[in-house]
Structures are given as C-alpha cells and as structure tokens.
Amino acid sequence: VLEVYYTSLRCRCVQESSVFIPRRFIDRIQILPRGNGCPRKEIIVWKKNKSIVCVDPQAEWIQRMMEVLRKRSSSTLPVPVFKRKIP
C-alpha cells in the first residue's frame, strides 16, 4: 500500500549508506522527495530490528527494489512504501 508520509521542514538524513540490505530485513521504506525544506531526495529504510538506515537514492540495489515495488503496487506489497507528497 502506498501512503503519503509528511515530515518536518528539514532533511532527515545526515549521511547515507549504499550497503545492500536484504528485503527480508526490511520493515518499510520511506521515500522523501526533494522539498519541504530539504534540498535533496531521501530514502529511509526501517529495518525489522528497529534500526533506521538512510540509503543513497543512487544505490543500484535500492533503485532495483523500488522498481520492483512500483510494479507490484497494484497488489499487496511485502515491503510497505511510504511516500511523502510534494505539493
């Protein structure tokens, strides 16, 4: 299920990682498009162990994963994606 995620007027990620995270460890993913006070797109992965990782949007693995999730968005997603809408 795609949902809108709102956040405060600033960036959430101080730094980010390109390290691959297997889907079985991922609880949900937040996509924060550029805007709302942040001059860059951010992707935040919430892991099942309750840790949070900011992922480099240019990392190939997250791009591939997001593409798969987008293609499956008509059905129930194994990994919920939360996307903040920019007005």
Epitope: C11, P39, I86
Partner: antibody
Framework: EVQLLESGGGLVQPGGSLRLSCAAS????????MSWVRQAPGKGLEWVSA????????YYADSVKGRFTISRDNSKNTLYLQMNSLRAEDTAVYYC????????????WGQGTLVTVSS | DTQMTQSPSTLSASVGDRVTITCRAS??????LAWYQQKPGKAPKLLIY???SLASGVPSRFSGSGSGTEFTLTISSLQPDDFATYYC?????????FGGGTKLEIK
C-alpha cells in the same frame, strides 16, 4: 539536448520591477526542479531561488525574500522570476538552471541575462 | 547559513601541473558538495557532485574528495582548457551557498 534561454533583462531604476523568463526545451520540464542563480559583475555565484516541478514548493535566498517571486508555466515550458523593489545590489547576470534529479545541483545552465539597477 | 570558503582565491600553474583547490564548510555537510567551472563570459559548468561523483562528459583528470567540512578539487594534469574560475556549492541545507571562487591562471 537541454536548452535554457533567458530573456527580460535590462536597465531598471532602483525601486523598479522586472520579470525574467527562461524558455526550456529538450527535457521534460514539468518533472524538473528549476533555479535562478546570479552573478554580480566581477563577483562570485549566488543562489537566488528554486521551484519544484509542479510549482508547489519554492525557496528563496534571504537577500531576495519578499521581493522576488519564482514561478513557472509548465504548459509553456517557461520559468519566471518576478523582481520587485530592485536595488543596486541586485545588478547581476541572472542564470536559469535545471537541477539534477533529486538534488539541488545545477546540472544545466542558460547563457544568462544581465539586469542592471541604476538611476 | 552554511558558509563556504575556498582557498586559494587565485592559483598560478602551468600546463601539466597537478593542482588542488580547497573548499571548507562552516559546519558539517557530509558529502553534499558540488564543483563548477566557469570561463570568462560563459555560464558555469557542473564538474562534480556528491563531493566525488563526476558529472556527465567531464574529463577524468578532474576528481573530488572530502567529507564533513573539508573538500578538495584536484586536476591531475592541467590542460590549456582548464584555466578558469572554480566554485564549490553546498546542498546540505537551504539556503544553498557557494564558495567565493578560485581563479586558476597561467603561470
């Protein structure tokens, strides 16, 4: 090929107004963040303003906030900068830029248009 | 606002030299830094973003490094076409800010 063509610059008196335009082509304009960057004669670069693809998000440098308004017409592939209450320190070449996807980095630049504020 | 300071403001070098330009941020900006090249009377051109990622079409003799508050732009072997003014820019937060520029001139 990405092309950005600014127009509307010229000589204006202090306190006056001017509207700059930037005609864009060669890319999907409505999906792109756009910005204005200026450069005073013999000086460095100064970021002025930015606008999201839909036009719903806008940002300004403190030096122009309340005086300048950035806008866009996606049906015309055109970016605008309405400049009011102009001051001598606004004299500069104004560049229209297209940002890289997802980050506030000017990947493409127009040739610039000169704005001179003088009495 | 995040202040960006470049050094030196002017740099004299010869063709074939290896040159380094430094950019310092007044606060940590991780790797949210871009470098631009500008020639007289022309618009700037993007060289590097995310501190070290080369923009499309930029020669491999240009490289960037650094993280946090200190960044460098290196040209491994100066070519005649490289004599220009170079600017850094942070995009860690708004307002976006540029360094004052480094003019690279022929010795």
């Amino acid at each position: 090929e990405v092309q950005l063509l600014e127009s509307g610059g010229g000589l204006v008196q202090p306190g006056g107004s001017l509207r700059l335009s930037c005609a864009a082509s060669g890319f999907t304009f409505g999906n792109s963040w756009m910005s204005w960057v200026r450069q005073a004669p013999g000086k460095g670069l100064e970021w002025v303003s930015a606008i999201s693809g839909s036009g719903g998000s806008t940002y300004y440098a403190d030096s122009v906030k309340g005086r300048f308004t950035i806008s866009r017409d996606n049906s015309k592939n055109t970016l605008y900068l309405q400049m009011n209450s102009l001051r001598a320190e606004d004299t500069a070449v104004y560049y229209c830029t297209r940002d890289l996807p997802g980050i506030a980095v000017a990947g493409y630049w127009g040739q610039g248009t000169l704005v001179t504020v003088s009495s | 606002d995040t202040q960006m300071t470049q050094s030196p403001s002017t740099l004299s070098a010869s063709v074939g030299d290896r040159v380094t330009i430094t950019c310092r941020a007044s606060e940590g900006i991780y790797h949210w830094l871009a470098w631009y090249q500008q020639k007289p009377g022309k618009a700037p051109k993007l060289l590097i973003y995310k501190a070290s990622s080369l923009a499309s079409g930029v020669p491999s003799r240009f490289s960037g490094s650094g993280s946090g508050t200190e960044f460098t732009l290196t040209i491994s072997s100066l070519q005649p076409d490289d004599f220009a003014t170079y600017y850094c820019q942070q995009y860690s937060n708004y307002p976006l800010t540029f360094g004052g520029g480094t003019k690279l001139e022929i010795k």
